[in-house]
Interface confidence: medium
């Protein structure tokens, strides 16, 4: 549609997992010269923030400071750009970005089977467990933007556990896991102690990437 600008990009610095009481910068940017940026948080504690765009080297951007992090600041964020004042017309929304607060509950334990040091090509499974009745476990690898997510299994020997099969080992890395409850998907536990997985053989940098969240495509956007 004529006059409707393509979606801007939304990034979290240093990342989308934010410890309780810490601050995250959500940067909305585009190569379209937007005068205004809006950052919208969906859900129970919805809110809309506004910043004037900064322009440099053909890029427009706005840095939204979110924090100190609390439960009501976690959620799904999208940003929009606006070029003109008359009529107020928003760009299509950015892809959604889920901001998660961590450090709320006791940390789970993370272990590797058959062990943290494996031969290249050998299958390895990471297990996350806790005595807390977490519904979900989330596994992150240092340097990766996305986490793998698995439902916790039934209680066994007093713990709730999820197994993350990494398949034939081709890469090492530092892993952490978090627990969360079904009713509060943006509120995670403290991180497990980091687990260094070492692969003896040829390391590569592939990591099973979970499917991207579906982005909301934009109708023409407008403000009243």
């Amino acid at each position: 549609h004529e006059g409707v600008h393509r979606k801007p990009s939304l990034l979290a610095h240093p990342g989308r997992l934010v410890k309780s009481e810490e601050t995250v910068i959500l940067q909305c940017w585009s190569d379209v010269r937007f005068e205004h940026f809006l950052l919208h948080r969906e859900g129970k504690f919805k809110d809309t923030l506004h910043l004037i765009g900064e322009h440099h080297d053909g890029v427009s951007k706005a840095n939204f400071s979110i924090g100190p992090m609390m439960q009501d600041l976690a959620g799904t964020y999208r940003c929009y750009g606006s070029v003109t004042h008359s009529p107020y017309q928003l760009s299509a929304p950015s892809d959604p970005l889920d901001i998660v607060i961590t450090g709320l509950y006791e940390k789970p334990s993370l272990s590797a089977q058959p062990g943290p040091t494996v031969l290249a090509g050998e299958s390895v499974t990471l297990s996350c467990s806790s005595r807390s009745s977490y519904d979900m476990y989330h596994l992150s690898r240092e340097g990766e933007a996305h986490e793998c997510r698995f439902s916790a299994g039934p209680k066994v020997n007093g713990t709730f556990q999820a197994d993350f099969p990494l398949g034939p080992a081709t890469h090492g890395g530092t892993y952490r896991c978090f627990g969360s409850f079904r009713d509060s998907p943006y509120e995670w536990s403290n991180s497990s102690d980091p687990l260094l997985v070492s692969v003896t053989g040829n390391p590569s940098n592939s990591w099973p990437s979970p499917t991207e969240p579906s982005s909301k495509t934009g109708n023409p956007r407008h403000l009243h």
Epitope: P87, Q89, N219, H224
Partner: antibody, heavy 120, light 113 residues
Framework: QVQLVQSGAGVKKPGSSVKVSCKAS????????ISWVRQAPGQGLEWMGG????????NYAQNFQGRVTITADESRNTAYMELSSLRSEDTAMYYC?????????????WGQGTLVTVSS | QSVLTQPPSVSGAPGQRVTISCTGS?????????VHWYQQLPGTAPKLLIY???NRPSGVPDRFSGSKSGTSASLAITGLQAEDEADYYC????????????FGGGTKVTVLA
């Protein structure tokens, strides 16, 4: 629950101005759009213009350009609509309405309306 | 004259189904803009009935439904009740106007005795 409470009815002389207020009680409207919509007796709804307090700017329907001014005082949670050079055909019920900036961008909350009568 | 065209009136007996059309053009509904519907009971302010073409706010009975196709939209009321007698307005946006928000002319729904 947010409510929009408008100022009371008034009778105005042709050629004069009227200023109607719209106060958000039970919440803020700074991150919403506030529009003004009028309805002449027995007629339909007509959008006059709107303001987005966080943008600090207003825009107006072509029919009202130059005659209407929409402002907001964030500290008072109040929006204002001033219509000048009044004529008899401006006799109408004037409503303020709140719209989300993003989905759903419909007018989800309306004021109770302010009846403005223009008569000599 | 309104940018969006609605029939001036429709009527039906209690329990019947009535539909109200809202016809626009390629610069408003046909451009992909959402359509919203409002109900205005006699002597009261308009109330949001359907938003985003087909979504009902909480508290609106599921007898009311909305749809959109091409350059037009429609509102359907099934199981018509006496309290549904009111004026109904569609609303969208128009990229060719600086008067950006546009309404239909309104449709009076009469519930026959």
């Amino acid at each position: 629950q947010v409510q929009l409470v408008q100022s009371g009815a008034g009778v105005k002389k042709p050629g004069s101005s009227v200023k109607v207020s719209c106060k958000a009680s039970g919440g803020t409207f700074s991150s919403y759009a506030i529009s003004w919509v009028r309805q002449a007796p027995g007629q339909g709804l007509e959008w006059m213009g709107g303001i987005i307090p966080i943008f600090g700017t207003s825009n107006y329907a072509q029919n009202f350009q130059g005659r209407v001014t929409i402002t907001a005082d964030e500290s008072r949670n109040t929006a204002y609509m001033e219509l000048s050079s009044l004529r008899s055909e401006d006799t109408a019920m004037y409503y303020c309405a709140r719209g989300e900036l993003v989905d759903p961008d419909a007018f989800d909350i309306w004021g109770q309306g302010t009846l403005v009568t223009v008569s000599s | 004259q309104s940018v969006l065209t609605q029939p001036p009136s429709v009527s039906g007996a209690p329990g019947q189904r009535v539909t109200i059309s809202c016809t626009g053009s390629s610069s408003n509904i046909g451009a992909g803009y959402d359509v919203h519907w409002y109900q205005q009971l006699p002597g009261t302010a308009p109330k949001l009935l359907i938003y985003g073409n087909s979504n009902r706010p909480s508290g609106v009975p599921d007898r009311f439904s909305g749809s959109k196709s091409g350059t037009s939209a429609s509102l359907a009321i099934t199981g018509l009740q006496a309290e549904d007698e009111a004026d109904y307005y569609c609303q969208s946006y128009d990229s060719s106007l600086s008067g950006y928000v546009v309404f239909g002319g309104g449709t009076k729904v009469t519930v026959l005795a």
